[in-house]
């Protein structure tokens, strides 16, 4: 058509059929065909609703366009051909694409992808579960804080990235049958000291306990410096006999011949029994007090400084080698005077008493027991009469202001000893502070009528020497040849005749 | 002023002897206990002989027992250390020392020292 | 023997502090343990002896404790001229015996 045929006000989107006509193209519509008025438009047919027939097939949709619609796969799907667009159901060839396939890392750590038709999904593997913020990641499930408990009491829980497992406690063994380390676990308490499955050093003895074990000295042994007892690296070493020589500045011919003795028995006594020690240590100390010799030269203070190193040496030397004494009763008696008594026995509740020849010590088994220490008690008591040569002038020192008795009536008068002096000791060596008394009954020369008769005991005074002191012993009775005094801690003891009368008490001793 | 000194120090092969004097000044020798302490070289107190006022006591730790012999001379204010067949375990700084009254047994003057080697 | 064991090898403080050195015996040895000083290159002094009696011409911020088996030496107010090691010694029985010593550094 001749351009001047054509007219020039058509619409957007038509066509002039002629110099007055338009028409709109293809896809497009106007109110009728063919229009002649210059205000009709022509609007895009959406051949993707009715009245339209187009039919884009399975797994896809139509998508309109201007003056004309495509046929589209739905997401997840892809035209076999791989073209984007096509025209009608029989071009369809729309198919499932394998997001899993295509993209191996779209599920990230422990998931596992899922090809699904049109998508994928994304599932945690076993023992992990998806993050909150980020539905593609999994992270570990804790089976073991999460609340589930999933293991038996006698296992513990371990967890592991995806799984957990339940096994045996330390010190515990699967029960017969049982796996170790699966949710079905059940375990049982291995005796390590009867199966032989624990580490204790020679020195000691195993102990089992629920879930472990302990070591423990052997009896008489005592753990090496620096290493606890009842561990599990307890070493120990043979009981040593404790070191015991002359005081250092003390010079005696026949103090050095005791101790040069002494320190031979100590030098055997690994290879004698405890009991023959004990025995031959109290020979020599009897014959020492029967014939002190030069010691009786010695100023009055040293025999004094002496007799306390003898009797402080005498209770560690016993306390040591009665460790390595089996359960049952010692008595022995010497020529000079010399007693000793001891009893070992397994912890019990009930009164011990030690019966000698002129004393008596009852007190409650409790109090020889070291705390921590389940081997056995002993609680001994030494009689030495003949050390009474050697504390010969000592001063009473009173309880309220650790006084020397001596008032203007008595100035420089002394007390009598009228007892022989005991020493008691026990297993425990903490007995400066008892928990119930400890009761000793006294027999001795007769008493003055009208004098005062005191229970004391020997204190060791800062000067390593010591005096005579009644702090926390009382007389409970005293008859004219027995008296009966109650002490709240232990040492040694003796009964004296203060010098002066009833009527005369001096206060401090009141 | 107490005063002690001690001398006859020097370098000495294994096996062989020494003897070591110490001259005490300005107070009753005669009335005190006196000793032998040595210093090691990593610093360390040994104490090695103790000799009582009269000297007919002497005492000995094992580690020098029938080699070492503590003497003294009460006329003369002088102690003696006689050292025989020495080791080199016995190289030290050896002091003289005098005990306080029993039973306050400190040693509460020391002289100067004198030194031992022990050495091949 | 009686071991006599001082841990602290070494002890560094400041002038005016308070410190305290330890001494632990091996066994009972009541109250018969003396301590010593020893300033660099002079002999050993005595300081305190019976584990508590300050020896003549000793400054009281020195005090000694303890019985039995452990001891200690207090230094309070500690002074510049304090610098020195210190040892303990136990006369319960021969042979007599030293701790290893505890050096005290000013800082």
């Known amino acids: 058509q001749d351009s001047r045929d054509c007219a020039r006000w058509c619409p957007e989107n038509s066509s002039c059929v002629n110099a007055t006509a338009c028409r709109c193209n293809p896809g497009f519509s106007s109110s009728s065909e063919i229009f002649t008025s210059p205000t009709e438009i022509c609007d895009d047919i959406n051949e993707c609703v009715p009245p339209s027939k187009v039919s884009c097939g399975k797994s896809s949709d139509c998508r309109n366009t201007e003056g004309s619609y495509d046929c589209v796969c739905n997401p997840g799907y892809e035209l076999v051909s791989g073209a984007k667009t096509f025209k009608n159901e029989s071009e369809n060839t729309c198919q499932d694409v394998d997001e899993c396939q295509q993209n191996p890392r779209l599920c990230k750590s422990y998931g596992t992808c899922v090809n699904t038709l049109g998508s994928f999904t994304c599932q945690c593997l076993p023992g992990f579960k998806f993050k909150p913020e980020d539905p593609k990641l999994c992270t570990d499930v804790n089976e073991c804080t999460s609340g589930q408990n999933p293991c038996h009491s006698s296992t513990h829980c371990l967890n592991n990235v995806g799984s957990y497992q339940c096994r045996c406690r330390p010190g515990w063994q699967p029960i017969p049958g049982s796996p170790n380390g699966p949710n079905n676990t059940v375990c049982e308490d291995v005796d390590e000291c009867s199966s032989g499955l624990h580490q204790c050093d020679s020195s000691t003895i195993c102990f089992n306990t629920v879930g472990l074990y302990t070591c423990r000295c052997r009896p008489g042994w005592e753990p090496k410096h620096g290493i606890p007892n009842n561990q599990k690296d307890t070493v120990c070493k043979d009981m040593h006999f404790p070191t015991w020589t002359p005081p250092p500045g003390v010079h005696s011919q026949t103090l050095s011949q005791f101790f040069n003795k002494v320190q031979d028995l100590g030098r055997d006594f690994k290879t004698r029994s405890a009991k023959v020690t004990i025995q031959s240590i109290l020979k020599e100390l009897d014959e020492l007090l029967e014939a002190p010799g030069d010691l009786e030269t010695l100023p009055r203070f040293q025999q004094h400084c002496v007799a306390t190193h003898l009797l402080d040496g005498l209770e560690d030397v016993f306390r040591g080698l009665s460790k390595n004494l089996s359960i049952g009763l010692l008595n022995f008696s010497y020529p000079a005077g010399t007693e000793f008594s001891l009893e070992v026995q397994k912890q019990v509740d009930r009164n011990v008493t030690l019966r000698q020849n002129q004393a008596t010590m009852q007190l409650h088994w409790n109090l020889a027991q070291k705390s921590g220490d389940p081997g056995p008690s002993v609680v001994g008591l030494v009689s030495v009469p003949g050390m009474g040569k050697l504390l010969a002038e000592v001063p009473l020192v009173s309880e309220p202001e650790n006084q020397v008795v001596r008032n203007e009536t008595h100035q420089g008068l002394l007390p009598i000893l009228l007892s022989d002096i005991i020493s008691a000791f026990l297993s425990n060596n903490d007995t400066q502070n008892l928990s119930s008394p400890v009761t000793f009954t006294f027999s001795h020369r007769s008493v003055i009528p009208r004098q005062k008769v005191l229970c004391v005991f020997w204190e060791h005074g800062q000067n390593g020497c010591g005096h005579w002191a009644t702090t926390g012993c009382s007389t409970m009775g005293t008859r004219d040849t027995s008296t009966i005094c109650r002490c709240t801690h232990l040492s040694s003891f003796a009964v004296l005749m203060a010098p002066y009368d009833v009527q005369e008490e001096d206060p401090v001793l009141t | 002023e107490v005063k002690l000194v001690e001398s006859g120090g020097g370098l000495v092969k294994p096996g062989g002897s020494l003897k070591l004097s110490c001259a005490a000044s300005g107070f009753a020798f005669s009335s005190y206990d006196m000793s032998w302490v040595r210093q090691t070289p990593e610093k360390r107190l040994e104490w090695v002989a103790t000799i009582s006022s009269g000297g007919n006591y002497t005492y000995y730790p094992d580690s020098v027992k029938g080699r070492f012999t503590f003497s003294r001379d009460n006329a003369r204010n002088t102690l003696y250390l006689q050292m025989s067949s020495l080791r080199s375990e016995d190289t030290a700084l050896y002091y003289c020392?005098?005990?306080?009254?029993?039973?306050?047994?400190?040693?509460?003057?020391w002289g100067q020292g004198t030194s031992v080697t022990v050495s091949s | 023997d009686i071991v006599m064991t001082q841990s602290q090898k070494f002890m560094s403080t400041s002038v005016g502090d308070r410190i305290i050195i330890t001494c632990k015996a091996s066994q009972n040895v009541r109250t018969t343990v003396d301590w010593y000083q020893q300033k660099p290159g002079q002999s050993p002094k005595v300081l305190i002896s019976l584990a508590s009696n300050r020896h003549t011409g000793v400054p009281d911020r020195f005090t000694g404790s303890g019985s039995g088996t452990d001891f200690t030496l207090t230094i309070s107010n500690v002074q510049s001229e304090d610098l020195a090691d210190y040892f303990c010694l136990q006369h319960r029985n021969y042979p007599l015996t030293f701790g290893g010593g505890t050096k005290l550094e000013i800082k």
């Open positions: 020392a005098r005990h306080y009254d029993y039973p306050d047994y400190a040693m509460d003057y």
